[in-house]
């Protein structure tokens, strides 16, 4: 039960967390004008991963795309790359993490094939957190270079215009959604890996069984699944129980006190 | 279509308190700001202060400790009020929408308020 | 403050001439976000109230007729009326719209000559 509640809860705050990532790369704020130098304008920039914004007092906001790509700073490619690598591989987790879920049943999918499942999961969650992390660290750490290297006529936004205004940016809320979020991915993805021990089948739970054959006796020893790379099963491996030996293909799979939450 | 208009007492003594509504129509109070605007007999345009459709406010430094303005959406009003008047005050008062580039593109009509006992 | 200073305090000029009127502020009204001036120019005919001409520095109002138009960029700023009109007579004010307080220029009187 204690693994089905940590898998279960490893996917919830993963979904939060990955969710979290696509809000912060779609937002706006990864960059806001500091105002501490001019607390009284009437005209507030802030700029985000694909455009720039400028919200007038009277309420009016225009935004404007980054069209060029060349023209932009090799910094914002890369956080643009990471959090997207992220998102992906975020989103290839959940997927694999669904089918992976203990409470929910496909076919007559195996603990082992659902503990690797989980596994690979956890590990996307957990790249996918990093992803996040570095991408967001990398953003504040050229904010905050940028910050002291505000002066006129310098690269000072995102959008690599020329300013003839000292204007410095500081921290959006994107910066702080994404380290929530990465942080958020990643713990998901660590309860992934600790509820797959919990799923895979240790060799001690099984007993070696004698199976008389008439004439001659053969000891089959047991051949459990251990969290292994690949989501396929070896069909052909023997799994021994107290109650018999039987090929993996001919064992049925029934409802058992863990199954269901 | 959008319309302001200003109204008040005409004639507040020194050192009371200047009180003027400004009743909108044709847009809404919450996505626009509105100015208050005035203008000595003779002289130019001195902006007193705004409060946009969030409800912030902002005020020229030279009146801020004077001034205040709030606004009644239910009335569709915005009011001014500006304390311990004396003769300096004696102006047309206006009231505008501030609109895109915080530029003020509707005015009232203004009103003449004078200060004198 | 920023201190807008408009140049000259009075101008008179011929029916069908250019008009051309100055404003000048203390500190930069470039918006680096949107690289737009926040300067906007009203005219006040006598007894009325202000209206909009320009906002942008040179981004026309609808209805403004096309013989007005701004220019200039930073601190320093014109309104050109290219061939004035009887009805152009009055009072042009400049305003910074970039930071608060939104102080207004002292005014220009453009007469027919």
């Known amino acids: 039960m204690a693994v089905t509640a940590c898998q279960g809860l490893g996917f919830v705050v993963s979904l939060i967390g990955i969710a979290g990532i696509i809000a912060a790369t779609c937002m706006d704020q990864w960059s806001t004008q500091d105002l501490y130098n001019n607390p009284v304008t009437a005209v507030f920039n802030y700029q985000g991963l694909w455009r720039s914004c400028v919200r007038e007092s009277s309420g009016f906001t225009e935004c404007r795309g980054y069209f060029t790509l060349l023209g932009l700073p090799a910094m914002l490619q890369a956080v643009r790359a990471l959090m997207i690598v992220g998102i992906v591989l975020g989103a290839i987790g959940l997927l694999v993490s669904i089918f992976a879920l203990k409470c929910i049943r496909i076919g007559s999918m195996e603990d082992s094939a659902k503990a690797n499942m989980t596994l690979t999961s956890g590990i996307m969650f957990i790249v996918s957190g990093l992803c996040a992390i570095a991408g967001v660290s990398v953003f504040a750490n050229m904010l905050v270079t940028n910050f002291w290297m505000s002066t006129a006529n310098m690269y000072t936004g995102m959008g690599g215009m020329v300013q003839t205004v000292q204007t410095r940016y500081t921290f959006g809320a994107a910066l702080f959604v994404g380290w929530v979020a990465g942080g958020l991915t990643l713990i998901g993805g660590v309860m992934m890996c600790i509820a797959c021990r919990g799923l895979a089948p240790e060799e001690t739970n099984y007993k070696a069984v004698s199976y008389h054959a008439s004439g001659h006796s053969v000891a089959y020893k047991p051949g459990g699944f251990k969290a292994s790379t690949g989501f396929g099963s070896n069909t052909k491996n023997k799994k021994i129980y107290d109650g018999g030996a039987r090929t993996e293909d001919e064992v049925q799979s029934y409802p058992s006190k863990h199954d269901y939450v | 279509q959008v319309q302001l208009q200003e109204s008040g007492p005409g004639l507040v003594k020194p050192s009371e308190t200047l009180s003027l509504t400004c009743t909108v129509s044709?847009?809404?109070?919450?996505?626009?700001?509105v100015s208050w605007i005035r203008q000595p007999p003779g002289k130019g345009l001195e902006w007193i202060g705004v409060?946009?459709?969030?409800?912030?406010?902002n005020y020229h430094s030279t009146l801020i400790s004077r001034v205040t303005i709030s606004v009644d959406t239910s009335k569709n009003q915005f009011s001014l009020k500006l304390s311990s008047v004396t003769a300096a005050d004696t102006a047309v008062y206006y009231c505008?929408?501030?609109?895109?580039?915080?530029?003020?593109?509707?005015w009232g009509q203004g009103t003449l308020v004078t200060v004198s006992s | 403050d920023i201190v807008m200073t408009q140049s000259p305090d009075s101008l008179a000029v011929s029916l069908g001439e250019r008009a051309t009127i100055n404003c000048k502020s203390s500190?930069?009204?470039?918006?680096?976000?949107?690289?737009?001036?926040?300067l906007t120019w009203y005219q006040q005919k006598p007894g009325q109230p202000p209206k909009l001409l320009i906002y942008?520095?040179?981004t026309r109002e609808s209805g403004v007729p096309d013989r007005f138009s701004g220019s200039g960029s930073g601190t320093d700023f014109t309104l050109t009326i290219s061939s004035l009109q009887a009805e152009d007579v009055a009072v042009y004010y400049c305003q910074n719209d970039y930071s608060f307080p939104l102080t207004f220029g002292g005014g220009t009187k453009l007469e027919i000559k």
């Open positions: 409060i946009w459709g969030d409800g912030s406010t």
């Open positions: 505008a929408r501030a609109g895109r580039g915080n530029a003020l593109d509707y």
């Open positions: 500190q930069s009204l470039l918006n680096s976000g949107n690289q737009k001036n926040y």
């Open positions: 942008w520095a040179s």
């Open positions: 044709g847009f809404s109070l919450t996505s626009y700001g």
